[in-house]
């Protein structure tokens, strides 16, 4: 046969040869010819490449900048990247989690509905009827308005969705 | 398009050293391949002596034992053989050869 | 070393029939990539060799398609479909998986 126009999966065409590419964590020394194998050398410390690749420098390992908040969630090898999240508290301000940013507090009349991780916010919804939320918090749902009859009690003042209703003593001239 | 071309003395005598350049031309001997020397003893087969890789890293025949050395000169595109402590048997035709593109081969007689 | 047997050692063909020729390794020259490397050369006379036939069956460029290469492992054949005068001349098998690398003895193409 003539020499190939199209290569199988995991090799690569150059110079009419079909040559092995260089696996996972590997990276490209020397092309193959017509007498020799493709040539490849692992990625050195702190250095990573994730495919089947013909490149002839590898990745640096992310770079998580404790300046930004960022710490290590998952240490890289040579063939994946270093995994980065945000210290306690806050969380990262995209999908590649280059930067952090302190989670956002729900405002009174508000409550959280999803408490934030290191990679999503806060996520927070307004109190309903008969839910109030007094405090500005990263953690605390909207809690129901106390129920004045269990204790015997009536209702005083009415709640709000930032005040909890006021149980007063029932009126005994109505008894 | 990738020439080789072997130079060297004809005659070398007995106990002596033997020393051959290649100089190539078209291609890098730095950029890939292996480059070889390969000699032909008159009326007989091929002999494979060794190689100099494009990294400047050996392989020789152990046939040739330790009297044998390749090298490299970079500046000049040029790659070398040295045989040391040569006999009658060492009398051939060298060529050296990137195995897809040959030297045209030199004569090299051991004789006193 | 892989010691490489070739057979006929001399070969007479009628121009225009096909010819054959066989070489044999002492240990597989598949590599664990699967790939084999295995050539085949041409020598005319008071000429270099000239590759032929690269990696089993791949013919090198500017190679007449009535050249192919075929086999596996330990077993490899040259077969010339239609043998031209130009053909005469003594073929070679040379394997490069393996250090040494090591041809083989040759097979000399005559016309009857």
């Known amino acids: 046969p003539e020499p190939p126009t199209a290569c199988r999966e995991k090799q690569y065409l150059i110079n009419s040869q079909c040559c092995s590419l260089c696996q996972p964590g590997q990276k490209l020394v020397s092309d193959c010819t017509e007498f020799t194998e493709t040539e490849c050398l692992p990625c050195g410390e702190s250095e990573f490449l994730d495919t089947w690749n013909r490149e002839t420098h590898c990745h640096q390992h992310k770079y998580c900048d404790p300046n930004l908040g960022l710490r290590v969630q998952q240490k890289g090898t040579s063939e994946t990247d270093t995994i980065c999240t945000c210290e306690e508290g806050w969380h990262c301000t995209s999908e590649a989690c280059e930067s952090c940013v302190l989670h956002r507090s729900c405002s009174p009349g508000f409550g959280v509905k999803q408490i934030a991780t290191g990679v999503s916010d806060t996520i927070c919804e307004p109190c309903p009827v008969g839910f109030f939320s007094n405090v500005s918090s990263a953690f605390e749902k909207c809690h129901p308005w106390t129920s004045c009859e269990t204790k015997d009690l009536v209702v005083q003042q009415a709640g709000t969705n930032k005040t909890d209703v006021v149980c007063g003593p029932q009126d005994r001239l109505r008894a | 398009q990738v020439q080789l071309q072997e130079s060297g003395p004809g005659l070398v005598k007995p106990s002596e050293t033997l020393s051959l350049t290649c100089t190539v031309s078209g291609y890098s001997i730095t950029s890939n391949y292996y480059w070889n020397w390969i000699r032909q003893p008159p009326g007989k087969g091929l002999e494979w002596m060794g190689y100099i890789r494009y990294d400047g890293s050996n392989n020789y025949n152990p046939s040739l034992k330790n009297r044998i050395t390749i090298s490299r000169d970079t500046s000049k595109n040029q790659f070398s053989l040295k045989l040391s402590s040569v006999t009658a048997a060492d009398t051939a035709v060298y060529y050296c050869?990137?195995?897809?593109?040959w030297g045209q081969g030199t004569l090299v007689t051991v004789s006193s | 070393d892989a010691v490489m047997t070739q057979s006929p050692l001399s070969l007479p063909v009628t121009l225009g029939e096909p010819a054959s020729i066989s070489c044999r390794s002492s240990?597989?020259?598949?590599?664990?990539?699967?790939?084999?490397?295995l050539n085949w050369f041409q020598q005319k006379p008071g000429q270099s060799p000239r590759l032929l036939i690269y990696r089993v069956s791949n013919r090198f460029s500017g190679v007449p398609d009535r050249f192919s290469g075929s086999g596996s492992g330990t077993d490899f054949t040259l077969k010339i479909s239609r043998v031209e005068a130009e053909d005469v001349g003594v073929y070679y098998c040379l394997q490069v998986t393996h250090v040494p690398f090591t041809f083989g003895q040759g097979t000399k193409l005559e016309i009857k």
């Open positions: 050869a990137r195995l897809d593109y």
């Open positions: 240990q597989s020259l598949e590599n664990t990539n699967g790939n084999t490397f």
